[in-house]
């Protein structure tokens, strides 16, 4: 019997300083490139090794970026979102949504190997 999969959603403000090679991540999404069904939001698809985001350590693959320097990323074309990041300046403030998967087992059941606390 499989457990239910739930998600813990949290938001965080991440301030990055643009490094010599930029911010150091890739994005997917946009109104013309829906990465998640019925969601035209912008998501992080790659964190570049030794880039600004990787060195900061808080931004993760799969995070949804809600805003850049206070500018909402809703209803943007993919390339417009890319351009927004590229023109965001030296100090970049990202409002991000982390979505952590939480596996819940059936109520009243502890599977083999589960820590007993």
């Amino acid at each position: 019997m499989n457990g239910r999969v739930d998600y813990l959603v949290t938001e965080e403000e991440i301030n990055l300083t643009r490094g010599p090679s930029g911010l150091g991540f890739n994005i997917v999404g946009g109104t013309d490139q829906q990465y998640v069904s019925n969601d035209s939001g912008i998501y992080v698809s790659r964190i570049k090794e030794n880039g600004a985001a990787a060195l900061d350590g808080r931004l993760q693959e799969g995070d949804k970026i809600l805003s850049v320097n206070g500018q909402d990323l809703k209803n943007l074309l993919h390339q417009d979102a890319v351009d927004l990041f590229r023109n965001a300046g030296y100090a970049v403030s990202l409002r991000v949504q982390h979505r952590l998967q939480v596996q819940n087992g059936p109520i009243g059941h502890r599977g083999e190997g589960d820590p007993s606390g």
Epitope: L23, N26, V28, Y35, S45, Q79, V82
Partner: nanobody
């Protein structure tokens, strides 16, 4: 993890044509930034062409002769190679990364890509 498989290589006479294919796994193929590189024996890996969400890029040595394209419904990228020359002889390798960089894109930089195929041999006699 993304798997890339190239096909379409072979032996062709100078002036001839070939079409290479690179088929990728994954349900979000349309979001991939993709490229072709080539490597001749004893030489460095060399950028050939790339295709992003917003456009295409070519090495000067192939401009006007090669065309990169993709079919998102088939999870496949193509390289149409015309007017082939003996110096085009190499193993042609497909590369990909998910999404678009938010930084300045350098299509010829191998570090832009996370996934690589095994390659397909092209020999021009």
């Amino acid at each position: 993890h993304v798997q890339l498989v190239e096909s379409g290589g072979g032996l062709v006479q100078a002036g001839g044509s070939l079409r290479l294919s690179c088929t990728a796994s994954g349900r979000t193929f349309s979001t991939y930034t993709m490229a072709w590189f080539r490597q001749a024996p004893g030489k460095e890996r060399e950028f050939v062409a790339a295709i992003t969400w917003s456009g295409t890029y070519y090495a000067d040595s192939v401009k006007g002769r090669f065309t990169i394209s993709r079919d998102n419904a088939k999870n496949t990228m193509y390289l149409q190679m015309n007017s082939l020359k003996p110096e085009d002889t190499a193993v042609y390798i497909c590369a990909a990364v998910i999404g678009s960089t938010v930084d300045s894109y350098t299509p010829s930089d191998p570090l832009e890509y996370d996934y690589w195929g095994q390659g397909t041999q092209v020999t021009v006699s």
